[in-house]
């Protein structure tokens, strides 16, 4: 229904706290360089204005669209051109072009320092002094670094953060209470960020139809007892929610997500038997819980998929009558039978089925042609299964750090032109798949591994788009989203690459490395490893292992030495010489 004042409607629906949080996230995601104080001031102005509209919907400007209101606020910021360059040109445009322009200027890799967590005492002090400001800072800092973070979900993580601080700041040993809990939230939030970015990429590059197909597959796996009409309704609603969030319409997105959660809880009987515990929770926890609810038990009496989609003489007729509905039904039926497959794999199978029908339905005897389609799925299914087995075996053998290094070598060989920091970040993230997925039961491994890898590779593609340097990466990134992971997996050593010359300073280290936290030490060592591969792309695993073991031994020795500086300055050059010899 149409409302006289959109802003008043959203304020009433969401309540002041969520309204303010979402406006802060929106501004922080659009203008990523502004300080918290600048954004907080704008948020307060917008909130005060919303309240005047709630009091009187006919008041001046209350009938304006949210894009107009927010865009006008952003464009009124002083020194916009000095701080944001050509983003200021967006302000010369009218809506909806102005908002599109803002979206195009979102930076997936803003040059902001890493978000450092203060030490426990300081955190607890500022949290106790002003919890609202403290949480505001959290929303601002995360949103500006992750401009596509799913806004209602970020509110959920802020709520988690709040609960952890409330609990741990009352403890004697704040540090040991806070650290593991906040690390857990951070890990989950980072995964949520790359997953959501993948959804927005799908929407931006391939449109709503592609996202809806993803949603149908995912929902059918989770709710195998829901009928196709129910799954279609949920997928349509979920597509709308994600389109709004990806498009910067965060108030609408959060409001519609709450509506969808309400609908699901009111219709559990036709959706799933597993929703009740989620539905008993308050809003943010409820929506989060529903988004990762366990799969319902599959119906026992499902007929073989072949009956309706291969053996039936009417296949081409049904396909001609309603292509999208027929393919959607196929995707639904196949997905509900295969919670053990990744969504990416299910979409590849649906694409193969569509291509088969396109080819076969044009023939004189279609049934003879499409009769073998299910057998043709086999190689498509085997490929990711083998990938999971090979990589999980390797992870179990090497552990997370060793597994990251193996991936780093592999990906540096595939795309040596890519910057070392990007390769290290990608390999570290890809390597986490082991810890995240390889410990799961067999039937959950494939969906976990492949859908996580796809999300990480999407980030690789986004960073590479900014400064394209590798033809290999460009080739894999320009195809369809579901083909990316197999494309990257199939890449081999880039034969066109001219090896980097050996620079001693790249492998020169100082005693300051000894005091770094373990994670930073690992990154230093992995940076050196990537550089070694760039110098010798065809070095064997044995050669690289020899060098890295020597390097680790050198660090261990010098960091334990009484005079660290002397050790580094005398042993360092010897290490460099040994490395050169080992790789010669």
């Amino acid at each position: 229904e149409a409302h006289k004042s959109e802003i008043a409607h959203r304020y009433n629906d969401l309540g002041e706290q969520h309204f303010k949080g979402l406006v802060l996230i929106a501004f922080s995601q659009y203008l990523q360089k502004c300080s918290y104080d600048e954004h907080a001031k704008l948020v307060q102005e917008v909130t005060d204005f919303a309240k005047t509209c709630v009091a009187d919907e006919s008041a001046a400007n209350c009938d304006k669209s949210l894009h107009t209101l927010f865009g006008d606020k952003l464009c009124a910021i002083p020194n916009l051109r000095e701080n944001y360059g050509e983003l200021a040109d967006c302000c010369t445009k009218q809506e909806p072009e102005r908002n599109e322009c803002f979206l195009q200027h979102k930076d997936d890799n803003p040059s902001l320092p890493p978000f450092e967590r203060p030490e426990a005492e300081a955190m607890c002090t500022s949290f106790k002094e002003n919890p609202t400001t403290f949480m505001g800072h959290y929303l601002h800092e995360v949103a500006r670094r992750h401009p596509y973070f799913y806004a209602p979900e970020l509110l959920y993580y802020a709520e988690q953060y709040n609960e952890i601080l409330t609990q741990c700041c009352a403890e004697a040993d704040k540090e040991s209470c806070l650290t593991p809990k906040l690390d857990g939230v951070k890990e989950k939030a980072l995964v949520s960020s790359v997953r959501q970015r993948m959804k927005c990429s799908s929407m931006q590059k391939f449109g709503e139809r592609a996202f809806k197909a993803w949603a149908v597959a995912r929902l059918s796996q989770t709710f195998p007892n829901a009928d196709f009409a129910e799954i279609t309704k949920l997928a349509t609603d979920l597509t709308k929610v994600n389109k709004e969030c990806c498009h910067g319409d965060l108030l609408e997105c959060a409001d519609d997500r709450a509506e969808l959660a309400k609908y699901m809880c009111e219709n559990q009987a036709t959706i799933s038997s597993k929703l009740q515990t989620c539905c008993d929770k308050p809003l943010l926890k409820k929506a989060h819980c529903l988004s990762e609810v366990e799969h319902d038990t599959m119906p026992a009496d499902l007929p073989a998929i072949a009956a309706d989609f291969v053996e039936d003489q009417e296949v081409c007729k049904n396909y001609a009558e309603a292509k999208d509905v027929f393919l959607g039904t196929f995707l639904y039926e196949y997905s509900r039978r295969h919670p053990d497959y990744s969504v990416s794999l299910l979409l590849r199978l649906a694409k193969k089925y569509e291509a088969t029908l396109e080819k076969c339905c044009a023939e004189a005897n279609p049934p003879a042609c499409y009769g073998t389609v299910l057998a043709e799925f086999q190689p498509l299914v085997e490929e990711p299964k083998n990938l999971v087995k090979t990589n999980c075996d390797l992870y179990e053998k090497l552990g997370e750090y060793g597994f990251q290094n193996a991936i780093l070598v592999r990906y540096t060989q595939k795309a040596p032109q890519v910057s070392t920091p990007t390769l290290v970040e990608a390999a570290r993230n890809l390597g986490r798949v082991g810890t995240k997925c390889c410990t799961l039961p067999e039937d959950q491994r494939l969906p976990c591994v492949e859908d996580y890898l796809s999300a990480i590779l999407n980030r690789v593609c986004l960073l590479h788009e900014k400064t394209p340097v590798s033809e290999h990466v460009t080739k894999c990134c320009s195809g369809s989203l579901v083909e990316r992971r197999p494309c990257f997996s199939a890449l081999t050593v880039d034969e066109t690459y001219v090896p980097k010359e050996f620079k001693a300073e790249t492998f020169t280290f100082h005693s300051d490395i000894c005091t770094l936290p373990e994670k930073e030490k690992q990154i230093k060592k992995q940076t050196a490893l990537a550089e070694l591969v760039k110098h010798k792309p065809k070095a064997t695993a044995e050669q690289l292992k020899t060098v890295m073991d020597d390097f680790a031994q050198f660090l261990d020795t010098c960091c334990k030495a009484a005079d660290k500086d002397t050790c580094f300055s005398t042993e360092g050059p010897n290490l460099v010489t040994r490395c050169k010899d080992a790789l010669a």
Epitope: Q313, V315, C316, K317, Y319, C361, A362, E363, P366
Partner: nanobody
């Protein structure tokens, strides 16, 4: 909405000829193979002939091979069945269908071969 409308049927003497047409709409005609099926009075459906989307491949039931010719004009979204040397046993309602479908969703056109 997919629509198939057959025409061209009628009463013809044994040994005579008829040309049936099927006007198609609501789908990409040239992307689909098409089929003629028939149903004689009191009998089940019988497959007659099929043609590929491009028109390059054709298939015929043994009972009509050499007498019937299937063709199509993709520019007119129309399927044809040229029937020569008609026999009494060719009397049936003729339907066009999409792909290999043997269950018609159209009205069909009645062909009666009788002296």
């Amino acid at each position: 909405k997919v629509q198939l409308v057959e025409s061209g049927g009628g009463l013809v003497q044994p040994g005579g000829s008829l040309r049936l047409s099927c006007a198609a709409s609501g789908f990409t005609f040239s992307s689909f193979g098409m089929t003629w099926v028939r149903q004689a009075p009191g009998k089940g459906l019988e497959w007659v002939s099929s043609i590929s989307g491009s028109g390059s491949d054709t298939l015929y039931a043994d009972s009509v091979r050499g007498r019937f010719t299937i063709s199509r004009d993709n520019s007119k979204n129309t399927l044809y069945l040229q029937m020569n040397s008609l026999r009494a046993e060719d009397t049936a309602v003729y339907y066009c269908t999409i792909g290999g479908s043997l269950s018609p969703s159209s009205q069909g056109t009645l062909v009666t071969v009788s002296s």
